[in-house]
Interface confidence: medium
Amino acid sequence: PEPPTACREKQYLINSQCCSLCQPGQKLVSDCTEFTETECLPCGESEFLDTWNRETHCHQHKYCDPNLGLRVQQKGTSETDTICTCEEGWHCTSEACESCVLHRSCSPGFGVKQIATGVSDTICEPCPVGFFSNVSSAFEKCHPWTSCETKDLVVQQAGTNKTDVVCGPQDRLRA
């Protein structure tokens, strides 16, 4: 028979034949042959693999470093990574939760909707049209664009969500 060019789900092609992938929680020890099945071994104590795979090494569980304010939210298994969270009153800087802050800042283009409390982190909101924020801040709301008209000036440069409008003198040379 012709050697396969594609394999079924949970299989992989090697040496012109289809071998079974190792199940989550196990790593590859040796590929299958004409006569033997794929050989897999369970991951070690602090290791995991979360997919059907042909990896020869398991991944290390994430370390929740207490020096960074992290603690274990959910202990890892042979099939799942450890999930870290921050100590009480602190907040993760990203979804991956690799470090902690007392309260997060809102980036330029975003303003503070609600200042952080001991329980909840800063809540940011995008600056709508007519408002801007040019700073990274844990406190500042979006500021309204300057009104050139009230200063008897005209808009020379339009504002954005990160910059104020630029006002300039009115063109006196009018026919």
Partner: nanobody, 116 residues
Framework: EVQLLESGGGLVQPGGSLRLSCAAS????????MQWVRRAPGKGLEWVSA????????YYADSVKGRFTISRDWSKNTLYLQMNSLRAEDTAVYYC?????????WGRGTLVTVSS
């Protein structure tokens, strides 16, 4: 390298005043929001006050509003916290911090003890 050095703490009687200073170096001082944070004995960290980069906007925790005043001096790259009407519950180590308050960076802080 960012360095923040707090000073001005000490022992003061209830109702007394203290002025804390924080000398900043290693970054452009005027670009950043600066903050004061404190840790009372055996307690977690508590945010106290913040000031915008331009110094025009100030923010305070409810527990210190009306008693503490934050300010900054760009010529000296220094942040201040004027503390009046001090209470026993203000006893803590006070830290200044730059913008985001990361868990892993703190100066030594300065100890404020309010006691009769």
């Amino acid at each position: 390298e960012v360095q923040l050095l707090e000073s001005g703490g000490g022992l003061v009687q209830p109702g007394g005043s203290l002025r804390l200073s924080c000398a900043a170096s290693g970054f452009t001082f005027g670009w950043y929001e600066m903050q004061w944070v404190r840790r009372a004995p055996g307690k977690g960290l508590e945010w106290v006050s913040a000031i915008s980069g331009d110094g025009y906007r100030t923010y305070y925790a409810d527990s210190v509003k009306g008693r503490f005043t934050i300010s900054r001096d760009w010529s000296k790259n220094t942040l201040y916290l004027q503390m009046n009407s001090l209470r026993a519950e203000d006893t803590a180590v006070y830290y200044c911090a730059k913008e985001l308050l990361y868990f892993d960076y703190w100066g030594r802080g300065t100890l404020v003890t309010v006691s009769s």
